[in-house]
């Protein structure tokens, strides 16, 4: 209805004597701002006066004046939206109807709110889920239809009168829709909580008791069982009898079925609370329990381990590991079913008793070839001695033994000979399947264990072989002691240490890396001419003409070896400089003249400088000076200077004559 004022607030608010009420409230007036507000207690409309009668708890007018006795009641709203109220403290006689009389410039409205104030704090209300099962987390809720900013309260949870350890989450609501305080407790009940009392206690800020609510927990759970056995230690011998009894200590709801299990498997036709086993055999040893079910599910008792004792059965031997490698450790395990476990063992190797070995395991820390053979054992317990089983075979594997490399050739061996070697050994398990040789080479193996080296190298100093099965055993290397001509013959400059300049004292050394036999002779040659027979070649004062290609030779009883040709380079400053002219030293004006600075130098000339007849340097750095077009004024004597890293040299003067062209002569 568009002619109504619109209000939003809780319909009824609850409190108790001495507490407070906080009334959240919003409104929308029909027109304009609020000009007058009166809060009535139990208002009644008077038709005669056309006004409301009743106790005025609060009044505000245009001038904004509020009587001093109204401090208990506070209007916390405003002129257009908010109509929130607070009564602090609240009294029993405040119960009833609150009337909010609102007036704007042209409109009036009376809004009614119910207030329920009790003499004492009213109890909270515990809400439980419809069903509670053991170990399943549930949320317990405690709800109180009260909350007020001026009166803090707390909700505490108790189990059988003792505060619960779990943390509760408390929330409050003070909105136009609802006013409440709520505590939620997450809790995983156990079967033992069934029938226990849970309390939600309302307390003031100081923890003082105000009121409470209680509920009894109904925790659904599987049956809880106890198993009893005769004899109590559940240890019997074959032929004895055993009785087991199942007792239900708790079940919610009531149980429906009973069964028995051995090693997790259900026993057929055993559906009573007593299990009788007569004349037991060793196969009946195992773990027994009873299972009782209700609507929640099956419950199981603890397990009883029934042990039926008997003498050891025929034994078997387990070897860790066979085949075994020589030097490794091996463990033998005697396996025989018996109850109680065997207390004594007798061990046999190849049928012969092994002295001092009485344990279930035999450990050999370092296996040798003679440990191979058949191992068997006998087990013994308090009820008797077992039989010896078939035994187990230990295979001991080892690398080839006593490997040697043998040279088949007559000695000495010369470079280029064909050498035959064989690889011998004493024993091996498993058999030798291949051979290896060191160093590796492109060599021939005409048969297993034989090596043929064609054209033996000078540097084949030693050879070793290995005989291999799963492992390789290497023989000690044998020396071939190959004889060869001198090697790596080269010319080495001893002095000077730096580059050779004309006039230097020069010494060349004939070096070689090795020779076998060691006795050697030298000789030097240059361009096929014999120069000397010493290891050194000396020049007191070198000249450019000594430059050239030098070789030295070294020989022994096996042969002779020449060095690579070594170029002797003599460095000298530019010499024999001259200026050549192209096309000639007489050129017609307007043509091109090219002057070339020719020289003999080592290293070659790196920088040229050109000069005219007045010794003025010309701005050219090249070997050629090109004058194009050449002019008559360019006639004159030119010279050049050549520079290298050793020094400088200069040419004599060369004269260029530039003559007039016929055109010029014709013009004169």
């Amino acid at each position: 209805d568009s002619s109504k004022w619109v209000f939003e607030h809780p319909e009824t608010l609850y409190a108790w004597e001495g507490a407070c009420v906080w009334i959240p409230c919003t409104y929308r007036a029909l027109d304009g701002d609020l000009e007058s507000f009166i809060l009535f207690h139990n208002p009644e409309y008077n038709k005669n006066t056309s006004k409301f009668d009743g106790t005025r708890l609060y009044e505000s007018t245009k001038d904004g004046k509020v009587p001093s006795e109204q401090k208990r009641v506070q209007f916390l709203g405003d002129k257009n939206k908010n109509c929130t109220l607070s009564i602090h403290p609240v009294h029993l006689n405040d119960s009833g109807q609150l009337g909010l009389r609102m007036e704007s410039k042209t409109e009036k409205w009376m809004e009614r709110i119910h207030l329920n104030v009790s003499e004492r704090p009213f109890p909270p209300h515990i809400q439980l889920p419809p069903e509670i099962q053991e170990s399943q987390e549930v949320t317990l809720t405690c709800l109180l239809n009260f909350s007020c900013y001026g009166y803090p309260i707390q909700l505490q949870w108790l189990l059988e009168g003792v505060p619960m350890r779990q943390a509760a989450v408390t929330s409050t609501s003070l909105t136009i829709k609802s006013v409440f305080t709520r505590s939620e407790l997450k809790f995983s009940p156990q079967w033992s909580h069934h029938g226990k009392i849970v309390t939600c206690q309302l307390q003031d800020a100081d923890g003082k008791f105000l009121s409470n609510d209680t509920v009894q927990l109904n925790v659904k759970h599987t049956p809880k069982l106890e198993i009893k056995v005769t004899p109590s230690d559940a240890i019997v011998r074959e032929g004895d009898s055993v009785t087991m009894t199942c007792e239900v200590s708790s079940s919610n709801p009531e149980y429906t079925t009973v069964s028995w299990l051995k090693d997790g498997t259900s026993l057929k036709k055993q559906n009573t609370f007593t299990l009788n086993l007569r004349e037991v055999t060793k196969d009946q040893s195992g773990k027994y329990c009873c299972q009782v079910s209700n609507d929640v599910g099956p419950g199981r008792s603890e397990e009883v381990f029934l042990q039926v004792q008997y003498a050891p059965e025929p034994s078997t031997v387990q070897i860790l590991h066979s085949p075994a490698v020589e030097g490794s450790q091996v463990e033998f395990l005697c396996m025989s079913l018996a109850n109680p476990l065997p207390t004594n063992y007798t061990w046999y190797h190849n049928g012969k008793e092994m002295q001092g070995r009485t344990e279930e395991k035999v450990h050999i820390p370092k296996i040798l070839p003679w440990h191979a053979g058949t191992y068997s054992c006998v087990a013994e317990n308090i009820l008797g001695t077992g039989q010896r089983g078939p035994g187990a075979e230990l295979d001991v594997q080892y690398p080839p033994k006593k490997v040697t490399t043998v040279i088949q050739n007559p000695m000495p061996i010369r470079e280029g000979d064909t050498v035959t070697l064989s690889c011998n050994y004493n024993s091996s398990n498993p058999s030798v399947t291949r051979y290896e040789w060191k160093p590796h080479g492109a060599w021939e193996e005409p048969s297993l264990g034989v090596l043929k080296i064609q054209n033996v190298g000078w540097d084949n100093t030693t050879i070793a072989c290995a005989a291999c099965n799963s492992w390789c055993s290497w023989a000690s290397p044998v020396a071939l002691n190959v004889q060869y001509a001198p090697r790596d013959v080269r010319v080495r400059k001893i002095k000077p240490l730096s580059e050779i300049h004309s006039g230097n004292s020069v010494s060349l050394q004939c070096d070689f890396s090795s020779s076998h036999p060691k006795e050697v002779q030298f000789f030097w040659e240059k361009n096929g001419r014999l120069l000397g027979k010493e290891s050194q070649l000396n020049f007191d004062s070198i000249s450019p003409e000594d430059a050239g290609s030098y070789s030295c030779w070294v020989n022994n009883s096996i042969g002779q070896t020449a060095s690579k040709a070594w170029t002797l380079e003599v460095l000298y400053a530019p010499r024999r400089l001259r200026v050549s002219m192209s096309p000639g030293d007489q050129v017609m004006e307007g043509k091109s003249a090219t002057l070339t600075c020719e020289s003999d130098a080592n290293p070659p000339v790196s920088h040229y400088t050109w000069f005219d007849w007045n010794n003025q340097s010309l701005p050219y750095h090249s070997q050629k000076l090109r004058l194009e077009p050449v002019k008559v004024q360019h006639s004159g004597a030119y010279w050049c200077q050549g520079t290298n890293s050793v020094g400088k040299g200069r040419s004599p003067l060369s004269t260029l004559t530039v003559y007039y062209s016929p055109e010029t002569i014709g013009r004169r």
Epitope: L618, P619, Y620
Partner: antibody, heavy 127, light 111 residues
Framework: EVQLQQSGPGLVKPSQTLSLTCAIS??????????WNWIRQSPSRGLEWLGR?????????DYASSVRGRVSINVDTSKNQYSLQLNAVTPEDTGVYYC?????????????????WGQGTMVTVSS | QSALTQPASASGSPGQSVTISCTGT?????????VSWYQQHPGKAPKLMIY???NRPSGVSNRFSGSKSGNTASLTISGLQAEDEADYYC???????????FGTGTQLTVL
């Protein structure tokens, strides 16, 4: 301080002659440690050395092979200036033309670099 | 006579170093120690920065240095500054009748 001041027209018709002058201040065109050069720059050819003139006991000049036969460099010692003449120009000769000094003596040793440049003249060859 | 080869562009951040290469032949860069380097800002004439491979004219910052190995010369600018952004050209004396040859030019950008 050595300065080079260039002058000459900015527009030349094809087949005509391009003439530019470079006035020297702070040095002499007769110096026997310098050469006097012309260099041009265009987007298509980059920087290009065209030629030089210099005086030792007499006057010498050198030209780049790309313009040899249609270029000459002349000197006016009285005005301390030198000039470039480039005949039979084509649009290919369009670019910025610079005069530059090459000081060839650095103390007692040889040197070679263009250490002073003119301000440059933009020349367009177009009809 | 073909031009000396330079990278078309190079760049670096302020404070960093940058090196520009200039490759020729044994008839020019490799044959003579007369390599020079020039800086050119837009619309301006080239300015000599390095002469005779590694010498600096007076007034040029010591952040600029030059070197040569075989047929390749290099210009290194250390501690880059915004004002170093320009085109850089190398030049060499040559044994051909065209006595001087220039590089193709490198545009340096300071990031």
């Amino acid at each position: 301080e050595v300065q080079l001041q260039q002058s000459g027209p900015g527009l030349v018709k094809p087949s005509q002659t391009l003439s530019l002058t470079c006035a020297i201040s702070g040095d002499s065109v007769l110096s026997n440690s310098d050469t006097w050069n012309w260099i041009r720059q265009s987007p298509s050819r980059g920087l290009e050395w065209l030629g030089r003139t210099y005086h030792r006991s007499t006057w010498y000049d050198d030209y780049a092979s790309s313009v040899r036969g249609r270029v000459s460099i002349n000197v006016d010692t009285s005005k301390n200036q030198y000039s470039l003449q480039l005949n039979a120009v084509t649009p290919e000769d369009t670019g910025v033309y610079y005069c530059a000094r090459d000081r060839l003596q650095d103390g007692n040793s040889w040197s070679d670099a263009f250490d002073v440049w003119g301000q440059g003249t933009m020349v367009t060859v177009s009809s | 006579q073909s031009a000396l080869t330079q990278p078309a562009s190079a760049s670096g951040s302020p404070g960093q170093s940058v090196t520009i290469s200039c490759t020729g032949t044994s008839s020019d860069v490799g044959g003579y120690n007369y390599v020079s380097w020039y800086q050119q800002h837009p619309g301006k004439a080239p300015k000599l920065m390095i002469y005779d491979v590694s010498n600096r004219p007076s007034g040029v910052s010591n952040r600029f240095s030059g070197s040569k190995s075989g047929n390749t010369a290099s210009l290194t600018i250390s501690g880059l500054q915004a004002e170093d952004e320009a085109d850089y050209y190398c030049s060499s004396y040559t044994s051909s009748s065209t006595l001087y040859v220039f590089g193709t030019g490198t545009q340096l950008t300071v990031l």
